[in-house]
């Protein structure tokens, strides 16, 4: 019960996310005028990934998109490839991830394809998360970068430009958006993996070890102690806990996912 | 084709106001700002404003705030601006002019423009 | 607000030479999407204003290429590589960042 609980809140909160993330990206507000030497202004601009907008003290706003990709900072491209990777690999896992739900039935899938496919979305959905939040953190680097550079230029003059047309930008309400869905989708990450230690198939610590005693079969099982003697080929042994019966056989033809993680 | 068709001329006293529209016809209305730029005899070219019909928010120069109001129409697919408090210096010709709302932003289709005499 | 500022404010002309305006604003004009909003209009007399040049360099459709633009930032230019009898009338430069301001326009007239 606890770990399909932990597995469809770690799909929901990655689903939100993600949902965040597609959010943050088409938003318009990535950095904003910085209004603190000018709080009384005309116009108020504002920049996203995609275009730069304006926006007229009666609420006219015009947005100018950035058409080419030559004439754009390398710095900004990689952004946009981060947010973008994120989605994509967000995306997948959530489509991985809705076949991993053990609430769901899927013809006759094994409880082992489910933890795989746990894990995997995991793996993805804290990798979006990661993309996201570096993505966002770059960009707010850049910003920092540029507005210590432009109140340098205003107070020293440099290079003899006019100071007074100088716009400096903040953070942007998409940088926090960002942040939160990359760090939503990193937990929900984090909680599908949790839920796929869950969801493997249990083995005990012990391989059963058989000592054969002339005549008969006999197979010590340590923990168990169920003995099963039997004659001819016909017999097989048996582990027998958590009340089902599997071959020793069965059992190892499907490797834990614990030996993976 | 493309066609902004403007109101025709108007003659007015100091103090009143004069409304000028302009029916756009040929592409899609909502698509496209509409300018209002006006020209005074043997002048240059002087921007008013903008409106976006799509949203019917509006823009105006600082110069004609409070005076200027412009308005939209969509299911005649018109344009209005309404200039109040008419002095002498307000008389010239009045144009509509689109802008793309999307690329350029460059006025690619003007109007005829409407003469408007403001005298006592 | 923007100032644009043209030269000269009369330009005489002969047919069938190239001719050149030029047309400088306060502040920049090249937007961080890499292109300059400036555009260059014709009037020609009795008539309406025409989109000749848009975004610095790009033709309008249907204006011969004789006409061309160039420039970035503040300083740009409008030439004339052979001016013909129906050029003349008074070409303006604007820039089209907010609020929109024109030249004070340039009128070209033959000899």
């Known amino acids: 019960m606890a770990v399909t609980a932990c597995q469809g809140l770690g799909f929901v909160v990655s689903l939100i996310g993600i949902a965040g993330i597609i959010a943050a990206t088409c938003m318009d507000q990535w950095s904003t005028q910085d209004l603190y030497n000018n709080p009384v202004t005309a116009v108020f601009n504002y920049q996203g990934l995609w275009r730069s907008c304006v926006r007229e003290s009666s609420g006219f706003t015009e947005c100018r998109g950035y058409f080419t990709l030559l004439g754009l900072p390398a710095m900004l491209q990689a952004v946009r490839a981060l947010m973008i990777v994120g989605i994509v690999l967000g995306a997948i896992g959530l489509l991985v991830s809705i076949f991993a739900l053990k609430c769901i039935r899927i013809g006759s899938m094994e409880d082992s394809a489910k933890a795989n496919m746990t894990l995997t979305s995991g793996i993805m959905f804290i990798v979006s998360g990661l993309c996201a939040i570096a993505g966002v953190s770059v960009f707010a680097n850049m910003l920092v970068t540029n507005f210590w550079m432009s109140t340098a230029n205003m107070y020293t003059g440099m290079g003899g430009m006019v100071q007074t047309v100088q716009t400096r930008y903040t953070f942007g309400a998409a940088l926090f958006v960002g942040w939160v869905a990359g760090g939503l989708t990193l937990i929900g990450g984090v909680m599908m993996c949790i839920a796929c230690r869950g969801l493997a198939p249990e083995e005990t610590n012990y391989k059963a070890v058989s000592y054969h005693a002339s005549g008969h079969s006999v197979a010590y099982k340590p923990g168990g102690f169920k003995a099963s003697t039997g004659f001819g080929s016909n017999t097989k042994n048996k582990k027998i806990y958590d009340g089902g019966a599997r071959t020793e056989d069965e059992v190892q033809s499907y490797p834990s996912k614990h030996d993976y993680v | 084709q493309v066609q902004l068709v403007q109101s025709g001329a108007e003659v007015k006293k100091p103090g009143a106001s004069v409304k000028v529209s302009c029916k756009a016809s040929?592409?899609?209305?909502?698509?496209?700002?509409m300018h209002w730029v006006r020209q005074a005899p043997g002048q240059g070219l002087e921007w008013m404003g903008i409106?976006?019909?799509?949203?019917?928010?509006?823009s105006y120069a600082q110069k004609f705030q409070g005076r200027v109001t412009m308005t939209r129409d969509t299911s005649t697919s018109t344009v209005y601006m309404e200039l109040s408090s008419l002095r002498s210096e307000d008389t010239a010709v009045y144009y509509c002019?689109?802008?793309?709302?999307?690329?350029?932003?460059?006025?690619?289709?003007w109007g005829q423009g409407t003469l408007v005499t403001v005298s006592s | 607000d923007i100032v644009m500022t043209q030269s000269p404010l009369s330009l005489p002309v002969t047919p069938g030479e190239p001719a050149s305006i030029s047309c400088r604003s306060s502040?920049?004009?090249?937007?961080?999407?890499?292109?300059?909003?400036l555009d260059w209009y014709l009037q020609k007399p009795g008539q309406s204003p025409q989109l000749l040049i848009y975004l610095g360099s790009n033709r309008a459709s249907g204006v011969p290429d004789r006409f061309s633009g160039s420039g970035s930032g503040t300083d740009f230019t409008l030439k004339i590589s052979r001016v013909e009898a129906e050029d003349v009338g008074v070409y303006y430069c604007?820039?089209?960042?907010?609020?929109?301001?024109f030249g004070q326009g340039t009128k070209v007239e033959i000899k």
């Open positions: 040929g592409y899609t209305f909502t698509s496209y700002y």
């Open positions: 502040q920049s004009l090249l937007h961080s999407n890499g292109y300059n909003y």
């Open positions: 604007m820039q089209d960042l907010w609020p929109r301001t």
């Open positions: 409106i976006n019909p799509s949203g019917g928010s509006t």
């Open positions: 002019a689109r802008s793309s709302a999307y690329g350029t932003y460059s006025m690619d289709y």
